[in-house]
């Protein structure tokens, strides 16, 4: 795994313990909580990051309002089960044997059940809508400058291929970033849109996951872009299965 050899750290994930005990004495970094070795040349999967976060719990974040149009991460933090590749297992259960199915970004997509609940496959989240409201500024941002800056951010900071940033919409003060990535489009080595969105979400909240880097300093033509609220909507390749009771609630 590529990690800074001089001081053996993981540039892309500060929630790791790194030691020079890899093959040939190379630096090896293991995610807190799971102990899984991570590739420090790219983003760590959201599942491993959540597991690491739960191993050193902080205050649970505020819950977002649910949406009838798409899945929203409305259950807050939980300690997930990750597969050997670091992806979410399709079925998640808590300590009291309450189980539910999740999508590829770990968001619940079924009603909660018991241990008999079956989740046949991990359903891919292929469309993520990041809805931001920025703080008041002297004037509106130039749409094309804003578009270019956000695309650059996802490309350079999160290593997400530009083709997966489908659109950037802007109607002051609301910014919407659309990420799209079908199973067939994602090649080996491509950053997952779910992981990129999670890193972005943590950056926006001032909780950067990057080691040693400063926090996110978003500027459009030198003007600071300060976000005051974020909502993230997740659309799956197969629609979620909730009971009518929830849908009408």
């Amino acid at each position: 795994h590529t990690a800074a050899q001089d001081n053996c750290t993981c540039p892309t994930n500060k929630m790791t313990v790194c030691s020079p005990d890899g093959p040939g004495g190379r630096c090896q970094c293991r995610a807190l909580g799971s102990g899984m070795a991570v590739d420090c040349s790219t983003l760590t999967s959201k599942c491993l990051l959540l597991k690491a976060r739960m191993s050193a719990p902080k205050n649970a974040r505020t819950l977002v309002r649910p949406s009838e149009h798409a899945l929203v991460d409305n259950d807050g933090l939980y300690d997930p089960d990750c597969d050997p590749e670091g992806r979410f297992k399709a079925r998640q259960c808590n300590q009291t044997s309450v189980c539910w199915c999740v999508n590829s970004v770990g968001v619940r997509r079924t009603d909660k059940g018991d241990l008999s609940l079956r989740c046949d496959e991990l359903v891919r989240t292929h469309h993520i809508l990041i809805d931001l409201r920025h703080r008041p500024t002297a004037g509106a941002f130039n749409h094309s400058d804003l578009d270019a800056e956000l695309r650059r951010l996802f490309r350079e900071r999160y290593r997400l291929h530009p083709k997966f940033v489908a659109a950037v919409h802007y109607e002051q003060p609301t910014i919407q970033i659309e990420l799209r990535q079908n199973t067939s489009q994602k090649a080996a080595g491509d950053v997952d849109i779910g992981d990129a969105a999670y890193y972005f979400e943590r950056d926006i909240k001032g909780e950067s996951l990057f080691q040693g880097r400063g926090g996110l300093d978003l500027r459009v033509r030198g003007e600071p872009l300060q976000v005051e609220r974020t909502l993230i909507y997740y659309l799956d390749e197969i629609p979620p299965k909730f009971s009518m009771k929830r849908l009408t609630a």
Partner: antibody, heavy 117, light 107 residues
Framework: EVQLVQSGAEVKKPGASVKVSCKAS????????INWVRQAPGQGLEWMGN????????NYNQKFKDRVTMTRDTSTSTVYMELSSLRSEDTAVYYC??????????WGQGTLVTVSS | EIVLTQSPATLSLSPGERATLSCRAS??????ISWYQQKPGQAPRLLIE???ESISGIPARFSGSGSGTDFTLTISSLEPEDFAVYYC?????????FGGGTKVEIK
């Protein structure tokens, strides 16, 4: 030469605690994980947890989480494993081991802990 | 927790014979498996890491293979000092776990 030297055998009563030490030499103490593994008489090997001496990060097997504490003293290159609320089934040989690459490359000589009333 | 199942529990062979020991993981662990030899009254000794990479000082008759969930330790020609208990161990994720062991005894 890498060496891990453990403290001597202990006899404890049920409910008591035991603290086993493991002194490392021959390598940079803070750079490598130290694992604790135990082996009950005639049984297999059981991983108890580990500690990274550089920053004292510990990770415990759920089975022992409420009873085990691993600490380190960098000034003496020593790691400690304390097991509390001892019961007869904790009678075992306790090993410390230094983790390299993918396996436990270096082992202490083992410390026999006997729990008996 | 990743469960490692070793088979057979006991292997009765004669010196000079080939020994094949199996270790099966409950889920895919890539090649994050190590093999150990343990003799009575001694600490375990690391033989193989990363499923197939030999450790310096370990005789060439010990070799490992496999990936994913199925792993094998092979001793090409048993020497008298090879009769011992052999354990596999995974380091894919915490908690690290060991197999139950295979005892290689003289027939």
């Amino acid at each position: 030469e890498v060496q891990l030297v453990q403290s001597g055998a202990e006899v404890k009563k049920p409910g008591a605690s035991v603290k086993v030490s493991c002194k490392a030499s021959g390598y940079t103490f803070t750079s490598y994980w130290i694992n604790w593994v135990r082996q009950a008489p005639g049984q297999g090997l059981e991983w108890m947890g580990n500690i990274y001496p550089s920053n004292s990060y510990t990770n415990y097997n759920q089975k022992f989480k409420d009873r085990v504490t691993m600490t380190r003293d960098t000034s003496t290159s020593t790691v400690y494993m304390e097991l509390s609320s001892l019961r007869s089934e904790d009678t075992a040989v306790y090993y410390c081991s230094s983790y390299r690459s993918d396996g436990f490359a270096y082992w202490g000589q083992g410390t026999l802990v006997t729990v008996s009333s | 927790e990743i469960v490692l199942t070793q088979s057979p529990a006991t292997l009765s062979l004669s010196p000079g014979e080939r020994a094949t020991l199996s270790c099966r993981a409950s889920q895919n662990i890539g090649t994050s498996i190590s093999w150990y030899q343990q003799k009575p009254g001694q600490a375990p000794r690391l033989l193989i890491e990363f499923a197939s990479e030999s450790i310096s000082g370990i005789p060439a008759r010990f070799s490992g293979s496999g990936s994913g969930t199925d792993f094998t330790l092979t001793i090409s020609s048993l020497e008298p000092e090879d009769f011992a208990v052999y354990y596999c161990q995974q380091s894919n994720s915490w908690p690290f776990t060991f197999g139950g062991g295979t005892k290689v005894e003289i027939k």
